[in-house]
């Protein structure tokens, strides 16, 4: 019987109850490999999930997330709520990024602005909740007598500490 079962292709299961060994996977089920004793029930893309690829006799359904949510985990096993740029998702919902941090996506966490001074550079463009700072030439490059084609960095807004 084992040898006969190995002849059953994807889309079938090896049916011990019948002389006709390879039976079709019934509706809403599939087998993606040959020689299966049972067919797996198709994944249902319901609620916050929507169908990206419908289930067939030989492959499972694939889900995406509905608008306003994004996939997490292998094969989109979870859907997480989107936030706006400049926000992060907390247990209490979407919250604005704290001062000194930013998030340029609808998902993920707020990350600290780049510390330009660590690379010996100065802040060329200030950071916002949605965007990281842009680092420019080092202050030494901008000292009198230094030849540079780069214009001097704009004055920082009050309250923005040097990076």
């Amino acid at each position: 019987l084992q040898d006969l079962c190995s002849n059953c292709p994807a889309g079938t299961f090896c049916d011990n109850n019948r002389s006709q060994i390879c039976s079709p996977c019934p509706p809403n089920s599939f087998s993606s490999a040959g020689g299966q004793r049972t067919c797996d029930i198709c994944r249902q893309c319901k609620g916050v999930f929507k169908t990206r690829k419908e289930c067939s006799s030989t492959s499972n359904a694939e889900c995406d997330c509905i608008s306003g949510y994004h996939c997490l985990g292998a094969e989109c096993s979870m859907c997480e709520q989107d936030c706006k740029q400049g926000q992060e998702l907390t247990k209490k919902g979407c919250k604005d990024c704290c001062f000194g941090t930013f998030n340029d996506q609808k998902r993920g966490i707020c990350r600290p602005w780049t510390n330009c001074s660590l690379d010996g550079k100065s802040v060329l463009v200030n950071g916002t909740k949605e965007r990281d700072v842009v680092c420019g030439p080092s202050p030494a490059d901008l000292s009198p007598g230094a030849s540079s084609a780069t214009p001097p960095a704009p004055a920082r807004e009050p309250g923005h500490s040097p990076q």
Epitope: C8, P9, A10, G11, T12, D15, N17, R18, Q20, C22, S23, P24, C25, P26, P27, N28, S29, T38, C39, E54, S56, S57, T58, S59
Partner: antibody
Framework: QVQLQQSGAELMKPGASVKISCKAT????????LEWIKQRPGHGLEWIGE????????NYNEKFKGKATFTANTSSNTAYMQLSSLTSEDSAVYYC??????????WGQGTLVTVSA | DVLMTQTPLSLPVSLGDQASISCRSS???????????LEWYLQKPGQSPKLLIY???NRFSGVPDRFSGSGSGTDFTLKISRVEAEDLGVYYC?????????FGGGTKLEIK
């Protein structure tokens, strides 16, 4: 969207054979079981059998073994059913249908086969 | 073979009425996987049959919610809560749990 387009009506002589086609569009043809159904006036609907085009595996209702033969061409996305040794009992409308959430989730428009001397 | 018996053979109704069609199988139609593959189809004159209900009680996409299916074991029912003109035709039950898969003889829904 899923569509099954069947070949046109056939007028056949007793003892002859006929090959009906079912062209599939709108889905991955090789991955779904395709079913065949017979409908005769006064006899209702009868399941003939099925084929999985990707592997060519087919199953038949015992009643139609030796009468119907299923084949499929995955390059043209077309399934075929050949009916042999035709008699007046084979005069019917034949449908192809695709498995989905049910055994016959999507149907072709049907092919009328008339067997007459 | 599993015999599927539908009653009544003909069902005259007035538009807006409720209609109920019974389907009885000659044996239990639970599949080896535990599911019951009992389906209902509607065939309008000159058309192919169309799927209405699958696995006893699930409405197929696009099927109005006035259609409902119920039952278990060997006794199944299709109900139409308020019959509309577009519902007229022949209704078939079908079992796909045992080979050969078999249809009921049909119930013709017609105007009284």
């Amino acid at each position: 969207q899923v569509q099954l387009q069947q070949s046109g009506a056939e007028l056949m002589k007793p003892g002859a054979s006929v090959k009906i086609s079912c062209k599939a569009t709108g889905y991955t043809f090789s991955s779904y079981w395709l079913e065949w159904i017979k409908q005769r006036p006064g006899h209702g609907l009868e399941w003939i059998g099925e084929i999985l085009p990707g592997s060519g595996v087919s199953n038949y209702n015992e009643k139609f073994k030796g009468k119907a033969t299923f084949t499929a061409n995955t390059s043209s996305n077309t399934a075929y059913m050949q009916l042999s040794s035709l008699t007046s009992e084979d005069s019917a409308v034949y449908y192809c249908a695709r498995l989905g959430l049910a055994w016959f989730a999507y149907w072709g428009q049907g092919t009328l086969v008339t067997v007459s001397a | 073979d599993v015999l599927m018996t539908q009653t009544p053979l003909s069902l005259p109704v007035s538009l807006g009425d409720q209609a109920s069609i019974s389907c009885r199988s000659s044996q239990n139609i639970v599949h080896g996987n535990g599911n019951t593959y009992l389906e209902w189809y509607l065939q309008k004159p000159g058309q192919s049959p169309k799927l209405l209900i699958y696995q006893v009680s699930n409405r197929f996409s696009g099927v109005p919610d006035r259609f409902s299916g119920s039952g278990s074991g060997t006794d199944f029912t299709l109900k139409i809560s308020r019959v509309e003109a577009e519902d007229l035709g022949v209704y078939y039950c079908f079992q796909g749990s045992h080979v050969p898969r078999t249809f009921g003889g049909g119930t013709k829904l017609e105007i009284k």
